[in-house]
């Protein structure tokens, strides 16, 4: 799976979309999880309604919401009041019983609020040394991760 980068501004909301084959994943619940380390597990953040037919209802876990357009085949995750600690690698998943299919790998980047003059040193920009000039940008907030880019911050 390629990784798609979604950028959001600190303090604002970020909407992440994950398209999928609606027929293949018909009847299956979806989830949003956070990757713990490069080879670590993906920790569930929020999943769609237990009753699949009600997947269109928005479900919240803290500041993260999930809703599923099962006909159109688009899973949408909303991260409200984006914070620097929200930056990192996530996955949209389709649940196959207790197993999960990865629908999309997502790298969330948190940009400093241009109106906020506090120290931006805490903000993490994965692969910030790389050139993003050739990257594909969707809706000006997402793009595919370039080959060779590091989706996790280097550990010192």
């Amino acid at each position: 799976h390629n990784t798609t980068v979604f950028q959001g501004v600190a303090g604002q909301s970020l909407q992440v979309s994950c398209p999928y084959d609606s027929m293949k994943h018909w009847g299956r619940r979806k989830a949003w999880c956070r990757q713990l380390g490069e080879k670590g597990p993906c920790q569930r953040v929020v999943s769609t309604h237990n009753l699949w037919l009600l997947s269109f209802l928005r479900r919240w876990n803290g500041s993260t919401a999930i809703t599923d357009d099962t006909l159109g085949g688009t899973l949408t995750i909303t991260l409200r009041n984006l914070q620097p600690h929200d930056a990192g690698l996530y996955q949209c998943q389709s649940l196959h019983g207790s197993e999960a299919d990865t629908l999309r790998k997502v790298l969330v980047e948190v940009l400093a609020d241009p109106l906020d003059h506090r120290d931006a040193g805490d903000l993490w920009f994965p692969g910030e040394s790389e050139s993003f000039e050739d990257a594909h940008v969707e809706h000006s907030i997402s793009r595919s991760l370039l080959e060779g880019e590091i989706p996790f911050p280097p550990t010192s």
């Epitope: 027929m23 009753l51 037919l53 019983g97 299919d101």
Partner: antibody
């Protein structure tokens, strides 16, 4: 009419290979997962695995992983179950079945093949 | 894997009587992912109930399903001669999906 038609009964010797088939008709074959279920003589149903003919994505029950291979040829709307080396304990009725999908927004098996009896004996 | 235990193993009843079949799961199962099947001798299984309580197309309303969590029930309100068969429950909430051992409903 939506239906799954399976290949005929087979009598094989231990160690031989076998591939049985399940042909779908009356619906878009690539749009529903197809599963395989084993029923040993006088016993209950066992879920073996499933395949999505649209892209051949496959899932196996741990009990059958490595014992059988599930495949599909979407160009002829057919799913397959195969063994490379049969054992006497593989003697059973094998059913293919369609996951309901769009019909029910559900993952239950709504359409079943008539079954293929496989007998393995020396 | 989730183990489904069906009881009783055999149910001996007369036509016109009410049949109550139980399916108990070793751990909680979402009601969205619990199904019931009927199998007659020499035939393939047939889907009766999906989502624990919804009847499949063409299934008479004398068949009904209920339950949640770990306890599910299939009820046949008035047994017809063609209802004498083996009934299986199945969960597909957890991998791998599993079937119960079956309940045989036989003529008393």
């Amino acid at each position: 009419e939506v239906q799954l038609v399976q290949s005929g009964a087979e009598v094989k010797k231990p160690g031989e290979s076998l591939k049985i088939s399940c042909k779908g008709s009356g619906y878009s074959f690539t749009s529903n997962w197809i599963g395989w279920v084993r029923q040993m003589p006088g016993k209950g149903l066992e879920w073996m695995g499933i395949i999505y003919p649209g892209d051949s994505d496959t899932r196996y029950s741990p009990s059958f992983q490595g014992q059988v291979t599930i495949s599909a040829d979407k160009s002829i709307s057919t799913a397959y179950l195969q063994w490379s080396s049969l054992k006497a304990s593989d003697t059973a009725m094998y059913y293919c079945a369609r996951e309901a999908g769009y019909d029910y927004g559900e993952l239950a098996f709504d359409i079943w093949g008539q079954g293929t009896m496989v007998t393995v004996s020396s | 894997e989730i183990v489904l235990t069906q009881s009783p193993g055999t149910l001996s009843l007369s036509p016109g009587e009410r049949a109550t079949l139980s399916c108990r799961a070793s751990q909680s199962v979402s009601s969205s992912y619990l199904a019931w099947y009927q199998q007659k001798p020499g035939q393939a299984p047939r889907l009766l109930i999906y989502g624990a309580s919804s009847r499949a197309t063409g299934i008479p309303d004398r068949f009904s399903g209920s339950g949640s969590g770990t306890d599910f029930t299939l009820t046949i309100s008035r047994l017809e001669p063609e209802d004498f068969a083996v009934y299986y429950c199945q969960q597909h909430d957890s991998s791998p999906p599993t079937f119960g051992g079956g309940t045989k409903v036989e003529i008393k």
